[in-house]
């Protein structure tokens, strides 16, 4: 009988130890969750406040509506220009409307005057189609004014208030474009 009682007591003690362990694990887990929650909240607050404080466009970029534009200060061939823009999370300028064209040409007049600037327009040498790099065709009013006589690959550029075409391997300034950050949170 005494042996039975001591066995039961030992089993109860074992159960108690297991429950204490479980409670300890639960407390640890709860603490860990609370810490994670604090971290997440802090992260969210930091993200929100930095988004709140940051301007819609990076330094040295110009904003118009929901776009940011960067006018390069170096010359490069068309392909290198696009690679430079892509590195900045942008692409060579894709002109969607006459309003956008007017804004760009107006801004260029103020900044630099009458130079050549590559945009994201290239001509397929076989079909003769002009294409923006997303694959869309320019609207009829935004087709390059002169067809280049070059046997090489032909790309589009802006000069003054015109869209023109040239051998893609010639050196020009370029204009990058990306979406502006939404400033309202």
């Amino acid at each position: 009988k005494l042996l039975q009682v001591s066995t039961i007591a030992m089993q109860q003690q074992e159960k108690l130890i297991q429950q204490e362990r479980a409670l300890l694990n639960f407390t640890e887990w709860k603490r860990s969750c609370a810490l994670q929650m604090k971290y997440c909240q802090a992260f969210m607050q930091n993200s929100l406040s930095s988004a709140h404080n940051s301007s819609p466009c990076p330094n040295n970029w110009i904003q118009n509506r929901e776009s940011c534009y960067y006018v390069s200060e170096i010359w490069s061939i068309w392909h290198t220009s696009q690679e430079n823009c892509l590195k900045e999370g942008s692409t060579l300028l894709q002109i969607e409307s006459k309003e956008e064209m007017d804004f760009i040409t107006g801004s260029l007049r103020k900044i630099k005057g009458s130079y050549d600037y590559w945009v994201g327009l290239s001509q397929d040498g076989h079909s003769g189609r002009w294409l923006w790099q997303d694959g869309s065709s320019p609207s009829p009013g935004l087709l390059p004014a002169e067809r280049s006589q070059s046997a090489n690959q032909v790309c589009g550029y802006v000069k003054s208030n015109s869209l023109l075409s040239s051998n893609c391997s010639t050196w020009k300034y370029f204009i990058c474009e990306k979406y502006a950050l939404r400033s309202s949170v």
């Epitope: 690679e83 892509l86 290239s122 294409l131 790099q133 694959g135 090489n152 690959q153």
Partner: nanobody
């Protein structure tokens, strides 16, 4: 250095299918329009299809419209051309093209 490597060509019977691939390197693939062109025996280069940088605006030459599908996987830097219901007149060397640069091509022969 820009490199384009086409594969997937072969001999197929009329009405059959093939899927061509083009592995691209040396440039930011996801930032550019990509094109498939072909050269039939004794003929010049012919534009087949192109696709926009993000996979939209796929456009085809009339003779392959509805039979061929151009697609791309920017994560894999790979361009594809799915060719169904192939005809004898589709026999050609197929090239993928980026800014006038082409690979070595892959031969597609449609014959019974």
């Amino acid at each position: 250095q820009v490199q384009l490597v086409e594969s997937g060509g072969g001999l197929v019977q009329p009405g059959g299918s093939l899927r061509l691939s083009c592995a691209a390197s040396g440039f930011t693939f996801s930032g550019y329009v990509m094109t498939w062109v072909r050269q039939a025996p004794g003929k010049g280069l012919e534009w087949v299809a192109h696709i926009g940088s993000g996979g939209g605006h796929a456009t085809y030459t009339d003779s392959v419209e509805g039979r061929f599908t151009i697609s791309r996987d920017n994560a894999k830097n790979t361009l594809y051309l799915q060719m169904n219901n192939l005809k004898a007149e589709d026999t050609a060397v197929y090239y993928c093209e980026f800014l006038g640069r082409r690979g070595q091509g892959t031969q597609v022969t449609v014959s019974s």
